[in-house]
C-alpha cells in the first residue's frame, strides 16, 4: 500500500515538473512572439513613414540632381564636422564638378551669405596632396586657391564662390552630402 502511494506521488511530481517545463516554454514562446511583434511593428512603422515621406531628401536638406545637401547652423572644427555628417548618414561635401560647385555657392548665397563652410577636402600630411575624405583626388579645377601657411593640418572650405584652405582646427560651418532617394514610382 505504502509503495503504491509512493509511486503515485512520484508520478504526480513528474507530471508537475513536465507542466512547469511546458509553462516555461510557453512563457518563452510568448516573450519571443511579443519581441517579434515589436520588430514587426517597428518595421511597418519605418516602411509607412518612408512611403509617406517619399521626398528624395530629408527635411531641411537641399536637393540637386542625385545629391542632398545639408548646410549646418553650427560651427565646428573639420574633424567634428566629419563626425556630425556621418551621424546623419552622410559625409562632408565632396565636389565632383564645376556645375556642383556653382550650385553650392549659389545656394549658399541665397541661404546665408559669405561665410566659411568646411568640405571633405584635406591635405595629406606627408605628400602635401589634396585628397577628398574617401581618398580620391579632386579634379585640377577644384583645388583650393591659396595654400594655408599653417604648420598644422590643412583642410578645405568653401567661401563665396571659392575653394580655400585653412587650419583644420579652426571653427566653421560645414556642408554634408548624401545620395538622394530614388523614386520607386
Amino acid at each position: 500500500k505504502l509503495l503504491q502511494v509512493s509511486t503515485i506521488a512520484m508520478q504526480q511530481q513528474e507530471k508537475l515538473i513536465q507542466q512547469e517545463r511546458a509553462l516555461l516554454n510557453f512563457t518563452e514562446w510568448k516573450r519571443s512572439c511579443a519581441l517579434q511583434m515589436k520588430y514587426c511593428q517597428a518595421f511597418m512603422q519605418n516602411s509607412l513613414s518612408s512611403a509617406h515621406n517619399s521626398s528624395p531628401c530629408p527635411n531641411n536638406w537641399i536637393q540637386n540632381r542625385e545629391s542632398c545637401y545639408y548646410v549646418s547652423e553650427i560651427w565646428s572644427i573639420w574633424h567634428t564636422s566629419q563626425e556630425n555628417c556621418l551621424k546623419e548618414g552622410s559625409t562632408l561635401l565632396q565636389i565632383e564638378s564645376k556645375e556642383e560647385m556653382d550650385f553650392i555657392t549659389g545656394s549658399l548665397r541665397k541661404i546665408k551669405g559669405s561665410y566659411d563652410y568646411w568640405v571633405g577636402l584635406s591635405q595629406d600630411g606627408h605628400s602635401g596632396r589634396w585628397l577628398w575624405q574617401d581618398g580620391s583626388s579632386p579634379s585640377p579645377g577644384l583645388l583650393p586657391a591659396e595654400r594655408s601657411q599653417s604648420a598644422n593640418q590643412v583642410c578645405g572650405y568653401v567661401k563665396s564662390n571659392s575653394l580655400l584652405s585653412s587650419n583644420c582646427s579652426t571653427w566653421k560651418y560645414f556642408i554634408c552630402e548624401k545620395y538622394a532617394l530614388r523614386s520607386s514610382v
Partner: nanobody, 116 residues
Framework: QVQLQESGGGLVQAGGSLRLSCAAS????????MAWYRQAPGKQRELVAG???????TYANSVRGRFTVSRDNAKSTVYLQMNTLQPEDTAVYYC??????????WGQGTQVTVSS
C-alpha cells in the same frame, strides 16, 4: 537596441596588417552609418573611418591610404582592413553605429598593439 561585437585585434609588428570585424545585431542597411573609432591611452577617442548606409566612405587623414573600411550587408558586418600599421596606431578600436535617429551605439572595443 543595436548590439555590436568587435573582433580581430591583437599584437602585430610595425609594417604588418590586421583586419577588424564588427558584427551587428541588426540589418546594417537600416542604419544611418557605421564607423570605427580608436582611443589611445591618455588620448581622446577619434574617428578612424566611417561608411554610410548608402555606401559613402570617410577616413581620418592619419589613416587614409593605409586603412580600408568595407561592409557585408548579408552578414551584418563592417570591416576595417589596416595595412602598414605604425606604433602610433596602437589603441583600443571601437565599432559604432548610428541609427536612423542618429543615436550612437558602441561595441566593447578590441585592442590593437603595434610593436616597433
Amino acid at each position: 537596441q543595436v548590439q555590436l561585437q568587435e573582433s580581430g585585434g591583437g599584437l602585430v609588428q610595425a609594417g604588418g596588417s590586421l583586419r577588424l570585424s564588427c558584427a551587428a545585431s541588426v540589418n546594417i542597411d537600416t542604419l544611418n552609418s557605421m564607423a570605427w573609432y580608436r582611443q589611445a591611452p591618455g588620448k581622446q577617442r577619434e574617428l578612424v573611418a566611417g561608411i554610410t548606409g548608402s555606401g559613402q566612405i570617410t577616413y581620418a587623414n592619419s589613416v587614409r591610404g593605409r586603412f580600408t573600411v568595407s561592409r557585408d550587408n548579408a552578414k551584418s558586418t563592417v570591416y576595417l582592413q589596416m595595412n602598414t600599421l605604425q606604433p602610433e596606431d596602437t589603441a583600443v578600436y571601437y565599432c559604432a553605429a548610428y541609427d536612423r535617429s542618429s543615436t550612437p551605439y558602441w561595441g566593447q572595443g578590441t585592442q590593437v598593439t603595434v610593436s616597433s
